[in-house]
């Protein structure tokens, strides 16, 4: 997992300065709110309700 | 280093009531969601209970299995997890683990304690 | 509820050979882009160990002998070559909605 300004996250993550960690993106399906889900690539799937 | 310590637990008759306690470090703790998943012989791994964020007022799921008799809680000043049990049950005998998950996966488990219902 | 149905429920593996562990779900758990599959590794007296995510994602610190593939319903974990050290019970858990579910493990063993 990388800091910000040196090499990006994986493929299918992104940075999360709220938890200081690469996030996957795969978990804004749950919480899209999450402030690395905006830095994912495609925007999340529809709303998800559990 | 993420660690989750468990108290409470051990032998208490049918109808009866425990309080489980975790209390977690290592991690931004209020920004995770906290469950409860037990363990037994018959019903393998179990979840039972989840509690979310204060952002969004401590929302809880429970499984039906429990739900009516346990009730899970937070202080997130004290980096800590409850379950209260009530009414408990001999089907309710097994390992209790609190573990956390962020939105999906349980990544980090306590190191389980036993409860056993009966008379 | 999304039923997972975990196979074999044991299974015997030579030193250095692949072990194969299937994991099936009752509904579909993956979107276009992700499934909502995970694995666990469990040793006696100790509580899960994470090891995959999202189906094929190995957390860090997990060896690359331990790999997860499949989308859909249908998912299986890989360990090859498999070591002593992996005598443990294996489990998958899904995501997909609540309640999240575990499988009814497989037992791997040496032989």
């Known amino acids: 997992e990388q800091a910000p300004g040196t090499a990006p996250c994986s493929r299918g993550s992104s940075w999360s300065a709220d938890l200081d960690k690469c996030m996957d993106c795969a978990a804004c399906r749950a919480r899209p709110h999450s402030d690395f889900c905006l830095g994912c690539a495609a925007a999340p799937p529809a709303p998800f309700r559990l | 280093e993420v660690k989750l310590q468990q108290s409470g637990g051990g032998l208490v008759q049918p109808g009866g009531s425990m309080k489980l306690s975790c209390v977690a470090s290592?991690?931004?703790?209020?920004?995770?969601?906290m469950n409860w998943v037990r363990q037994s012989p018959e019903q393998g791994l179990e979840w039972i209970a989840e509690i979310r964020l204060q952002s969004n007022d401590y929302p809880t799921h429970y499984a039906e299995s429990v739900k009516g008799r346990f009730t899970i809680s937070r202080d997130d000043s004290k980096n800590s997890v409850y379950l209260q049990m009530n009414n408990l049950r001999p089907e309710d005998t097994g390992i209790y683990y609190c573990?956390?998950?962020?939105?999906?996966?349980?990544?980090?488990w306590g190191q389980g304690t036993t409860l056993t219902v009966s008379s | 509820d999304t039923v997972l149905t975990q196979s074999p429920a044991s299974l015997v593996v030579s030193l250095g050979q692949r072990a194969t562990i299937s994991c099936r779900a009752s509904?579909?758990?993956?979107?276009?882009?992700?499934?909502?599959i995970h694995w666990y590794q469990q040793k006696p007296g100790q509580p899960p160990k994470f090891l995959i995510k999202?189906?094929?994602n190995r957390d860090s610190g997990v060896p690359a002998r331990f790999s997860g593939s499949g989308s859909g319903t249908d998912f299986t974990l890989n360990i090859h070559p498999v070591e002593e050290d992996d005598t443990a019970i294996y489990y998958c858990q899904h995501s997909w909605e609540i309640p999240p579910t575990f499988g009814a493990g497989t037992k791997l063993e040496l032989q």
């Open positions: 290592g991690f931004t703790f209020s920004y995770y969601w």
């Open positions: 573990a956390c998950r962020y939105a999906d996966y349980f990544d980090h």
């Open positions: 999202y189906a094929s």
């Open positions: 509904q579909s758990v993956s979107t276009s882009d992700y499934s909502y």
